[in-house]
Amino acid sequence: WPPPGTGDIIVQAPTQVPGFLGDSVTLPCYLQVPGMEETHVSQLTWSRHGESGSMAVFHQTQGPNYSEPKRLEFVAARLGTELRDASLRMFGLRVEDEGNYTCLFVTFPQGSRSVDIWLRVLAKPQNTAEVQKVQLTGKPVPVARCVSTGGRPPAHITWHSDLGGMPNTSQAPGFLSGTVTVTSLWILVPSSQVDGKSVTCKVEHESFEKPQLLTVNLTVYYPPEVSISGYDNNWYLSQNEATLTCDARSNPEPTGYNWSTTMGPLPPFAVAQGAQLLIRPVDKPINTTFICNVTNALGARQAELTVQVKEGPPSEPSGMSSN
């Protein structure tokens, strides 16, 4: 707002006023008169830059006159009162209402005093974020999608991620004329390490008090990644039974585990129990390579582990007895 005048009358108004599409907005405009100054306002006038004629006039004796009576209204000006408040209300804001307006007071004997106000027509966007479920493509693909719908001006979208990648942002006209829908994709090369991790879409718009943060949990479909655990290279004869575990990471979850050996089916001392393989005590040394084959909807993968059961008791309980 301009500083108060010291001796002269002055028109006070904000340089910019925001309003929302379809809503009403008040363009404030006041005449400030120093204490000693005598003035008489005969007319208030609102006009739009680049247009001939006035859109709203309030005359001291004739009252208001509007170019669009259903959409315009003087907020405070009334016949028979001092015309010091020219504030104008606009209803049903349209995109084409955005622009520069002049509020003018005709005062006597000082003459005309005016101020320009920029009306910004805003539309608050609706924001959504969703995962783009992908498989291991080996090349960059969209893994998350963030959409800011129907904003005016267009929303600004950024991404926050520890996974690497890059954004791809585009704009398209919104449903309402003058609005814009912004779509941003987060693109990276999918890997199993990405699955289950999150990225955050940040949407900024001047209609928001603070940026909106939308978190997306990523989904990467991949076949099983398999390993076998439970063997520590120190298994001996005459020890307790032990367990091998088939560790599988996959998306979707594994649908089946199949144990075998390089020689074919499992030997009698090995009993499959789903993801686990129970190794019972044996009375002679063995050297067997076990295979765990894991299946999910995308395929099957396997891991191998060679187990040796050696002669001679350990110096202290370990090996098979440790499991």
Partner: antibody, heavy 121, light 109 residues
Framework: QVQLVQSGAEVKKPGASVKVSCKAS????????ISWVRQAPGQGLEWIAW????????NYNQKFTGRVTMTTDTSTSTAYMELRSLRSDDTAVYYC??????????????WGQGTTVTVSS | QAVVTQEPSLTVSPGGTVTLTCRSS?????????ANWVQQKPGQAFRGLIG???NRAPGVPARFSGSLLGDKAALTLSGAQPEDEAEYYC?????????FGGGTKLTVL
Amino acid sequence: QVQLVQSGAEVKKPGASVKVSCKASGYTFTSSYISWVRQAPGQGLEWIAWIYAGTGDTNYNQKFTGRVTMTTDTSTSTAYMELRSLRSDDTAVYYCARHGYTGRGWYFAVWGQGTTVTVSS
Amino acid sequence: QAVVTQEPSLTVSPGGTVTLTCRSSTGAVTTSNYANWVQQKPGQAFRGLIGGTNNRAPGVPARFSGSLLGDKAALTLSGAQPEDEAEYYCILWYSNHFVFGGGTKLTVL
């Protein structure tokens, strides 16, 4: 064309009142500001007051407050100035003047021919 | 009340330029005084020339111009004509009242 025609000369006794009229033509009377100005013999011009014809809003020179009343009759497009408690130093030619507007500033546009008021016992 | 002072008389040759000034007893004349200038020819009614310091009234020849000159209001007549011979009054606004100057008698000789 725009014209202001004032009433004729008046001779008044001290303590009396005088009411001078100013009939306007050629423009929208209700949208106008009219000032009253006087000039005493051998003296300069002195502003008395202005009135906004449409509403009757007025602004008086403090020197005359309480003694002068300005009114308008919009039906006849006439402005009036009444001065009470007349003294001999109120003897002067009284003028009405319509203020015009250029779009940026006001000016003393059109003047009446003047009304001579003589205050004498 | 303030006193507004003008040159009592000035003379200009036909076609010449002359500047009439208007001084305020309260200090510098500013745009907030909305200086007005009116003309009165002998036997004729007053006529408004300038309002709001420098706004020429409709129909007033362009040879008349209003301005602020230093701490005074000024009326400049460029290319004086014999018909410009008249009395010129300056009027200043002081927050809530007008004050007239004593007038300048301009002779075109």
